[in-house]
Interface confidence: medium
Amino acid sequence: KKVVLGKKGDTVELTCTASQKKSIQFHWKNSNQIKILGNQGSFLTKGPSKLNDRADSRRSLWDQGNFPLIIKNLKIEDSDTYICEVEDQKEEVQLLVFGLTANSDTHLLQGQSLTLTLESPPGSSPSVQCRSPRGKNIQGGKTLSVSQLELQDSGTWTCTVLQNQKKVEFKIDIVVLAFQKASSIVYKKEGEQVEFSFPLAFTVEKLTGSGELWWQAERASSSKSWITFDLKNKEVSVKRVTQDPKLQMGKKLPLHLTLPQALPQYAGSGNLTLALEAKTGKLHQEVNLVVMRATQLQKNLTCEVWGPTSPKLMLSLKLENKEAKVSKREKAVWVLNPEAGMWQCLLSDSGQVLLESNIKVLPTWSTPVQP
């Protein structure tokens, strides 16, 4: 008996071939001997089976002795043995219809779980193997689960169902809803305007939800909500913003925030959360702000940084075109009685300068100038 695997919702064509290459009488029946379809001369006739309007044949092939049974919009319950009767012969074809569906939704938040469920006909014992867009293989039976979805899991999942040495392939498009970056860091000199961007890693037709930026300033004992906003069909509208600092927010995606100026008291870490309509859970992106200030008070030239810096970052003070006078893995460096000239304060990581602030030290009878 020939075995054919079909996919729920798809169309399948079961073949039936006569030895004579001409149009002769045939009919297809199911295992209950109920007639599905057949012919009367050049006319297609249909029997009382539950397939009725979903069943068809190709009249153009009858003259060549081919009498296929086409079943459209396959259902799991269409799994059966189909019998083609032609020239006093019976050809049996076993059709097994499988379905593979994702739990609830194919748009999932980063960190959530994806469950794929296999629908199969009674008596079948299929095995399933799925390959994620990043090449990860998962095997299972009736259900397959992937916990802690990551951004790289977005894309087409290819799942192969194996039964009786035959296989059928399913493709499921999964969209992982996340920000492009889990975390970002902005380095600014004191007084500069700060731009924060929160690009999303997905595109959908309509995007609705609400969000908030909580900020933990390094100098503050507790975190504070800096801004709350709504998102309606990709349009951003601010609900509430603190008076200090007064953030500005772009009206279109990607989410974009402007801090009027970088100040030591604003340096710290923020967490932008976005709750999407009809989704449980929230998207998160961490943002960090490091602020540098170079000052000269009396005979002391000081350079300080505030905010989340890693222990391997180096802070240096140097006179332009000269060797560093002082370099430390600390948040403040200073030089006593600095000589006149343009001094540079540098924050660097493995030799790469992340932030630079210049301060002009004038001869001792003058006051310093900050360019």
Epitope: E190, G191, K246, P260, Q261
Partner: antibody
């Protein structure tokens, strides 16, 4: 101690412009927002706008948006508020202010009387 | 804009008694457990003086005779016991949302 010292009284004709200054001392000028508030004679207080002196980012009340420009000069620790196309109902005392540790305006300039008269 | 309505427009209180001024906001000025309402005192020819911030916090240097209360849309400034020096105009101000707005003022007279 924190001090905000404003420029002297001005008399202007309708249609002219006025620029009021506010010199800050006793704190790091770029660390705090400077606000501008006005008060017509015998009337209440009205917020005009504000500036972040470090970056020069300014925000103003929509009522004044097309007529007001708020600026700051870091080198002199001075904030400015310029009001254009003056009308007689712009006659008022103009104050600059700075918040304290809370959300209220704890420090105020002495006020600048601007009289608009033909 | 958030409209702040003060009442009464003026009041006369005897020395040593309690003065109560109310301020009603056109919408809630609460957020995250705080009420963004401030109170000022202003005497003729002087700039306003901050008395209370965030509804109930006393500004440093202000005597404890002044107290603020309320949340949401309804706020109260109490002065008790009233002193001669308290004769002035009092303003409420919201710092919840731009544009920042003030009440129309309440003139306090001491009898």
């Amino acid at each position: 101690q924190v001090q905000l010292v404003q420029s002297g009284a001005e008399v202007k004709k309708p249609g002219a412009s006025v620029k009021v200054s506010c010199k800050a001392s006793g704190y790091t000028f770029t660390d705090y927002v400077i606000h501008w508030v006005r008060q017509a004679t015998g009337q209440g207080l009205e917020w005009i706008g504000e500036i972040y002196p470090g970056s020069g980012s300014a925000y103003s009340n929509a009522k004044f948006k097309d007529r007001v420009t708020i600026t700051a000069d870091k080198s002199t620790n001075t904030a400015y508020m310029e009001l254009r196309s003056l009308r007689s109902d712009d006659t008022a005392v103009y104050f600059c202010a700075r918040r304290g540790n809370g959300t209220g305006f704890a420090y105020w300039g002495q006020g600048t009387l601007v009289t608009v008269s033909s | 804009d958030i409209v702040l309505t003060q009442s009464p427009a003026s009041l006369a209180v005897s020395l040593g008694q309690r003065a109560t001024i109310t301020c009603k906001a056109g919408q809630s000025v609460d957020y995250d457990g705080d009420s963004y309402m401030n109170w000022y005192q202003q005497k003729p020819g002087q700039p306003p003086k901050l008395l209370i911030y965030v509804a109930s916090n006393l500004e440093s240097g202000i005597p404890a005779r002044f107290s603020g209360s309320g949340s949401g849309t309804d706020f109260t400034l109490n002065i008790h016991p009233v002193e001669e020096n308290d004769a002035a105009t009092y303003y409420c101000q919201q710092s919840y949302k731009d544009p920042l707005t003030f009440g129309q003022g309440t003139k306090l007279e001491i009898k």
